[in-house]
């Protein structure tokens, strides 16, 4: 079984489906946000370019105890070819500013929607 985004499926999930599901989850997070997401936790912002999925996971995986983003963390791991652990930052990850998780999610969502519209599913 292939497990992506926490859902078991009979075969590999098409990249377009996986990206759409990730977008839907981020939309769900932003729309259901009442109190500050993850209680205002701050994470490193990322360059939304090559290696974006791993960089996003590297940033968000450091936040623990925030159930609202646990599914997103699992889904991002399906897009990242290597295992990511808390405190791990690749050379692609430039640590220049921290932003609230809520802003991180909004920025990521906008970029993923753009990629989806342009047919860039990987």
């Amino acid at each position: 079984l292939t497990c992506l985004g926490g859902f078991a499926s009979p075969g590999p999930v098409p990249p377009s489906t996986a990206l759409r599901e990730l977008i839907e989850e981020l939309v769900n997070i932003t729309q259901n946000q009442k109190a500050p997401l993850c209680n205002g936790s701050m994470v490193w912002s990322i360059n939304l370019t090559a290696g974006m999925y791993c960089a996003a996971l590297e940033s968000l995986i450091n936040v623990s105890g925030c159930s609202a983003i646990e599914k997103t963390q699992r889904m991002l791991s399906g897009f990242c070819p290597h295992k990511v652990s808390a405190g791990q930052f690749s050379s692609l990850h430039v640590r220049d500013t921290k932003i609230e998780v809520a802003q991180f999610v909004k920025d990521l969502l906008l970029h993923l929607k753009k990629l989806f519209r342009e047919g860039q599913f990987n």
Epitope: P36, N39, G40, S41, N62
Partner: nanobody, 116 residues
Framework: GVQLLESGGGLVQPGGSLRLSCVAS????????MDWVRQAPGKGLEWVST????????YYADSVKGRFTISRDNSKNTLYLQMNSLRAEDTAVYYC?????????WGPGTLVTVSS
């Protein structure tokens, strides 16, 4: 649990200096990445600076680069922020935070007012 207590804030004239301190308890301080975050009156949270556990890595927001210096003394479980060349726009409540934790685990903050 995590406890953080900031001190060192106050009223200072533009161009002046202050040194903020934050005493930490309830967690293993020397392996924790630590942040300074601020909130200006009526504004949102703004990240100021981060220091890695080993003190090897220090990171700053563009708005404070070259003026502020973050440091830590792991033997005293204390985080510092040396603020020089202060400007009116640095007026804010400054919070010390264990990185990646929510506001419920931050300290109460210390108010810095820069005014002539």
């Amino acid at each position: 649990g995590v406890q953080l207590l900031e001190s060192g804030g106050g009223l200072v004239q533009p161009g002046g200096s202050l040194r903020l301190s934050c005493v930490a308890s309830g967690f293993t301080f020397d392996v924790a990445e630590m942040d300074w975050v601020r909130q200006a009156p009526g504004k949102g949270l703004e990240w100021v600076s981060t220091i890695s556990p080993s003190r090897r890595g220090t990171y700053y927001a563009d708005s404070v680069k070259g003026r502020f210096t973050i440091s830590r003394d792991n033997s005293k479980n204390t985080l510092y922020l040396q603020m020089n060349s202060l400007r009116a726009e640095d007026t804010a409540v400054y919070y010390c935070a264990k990185a990646y934790t929510g506001r419920s685990l931050w300290g109460p903050g210390t108010l810095v007012t820069v005014s002539s």
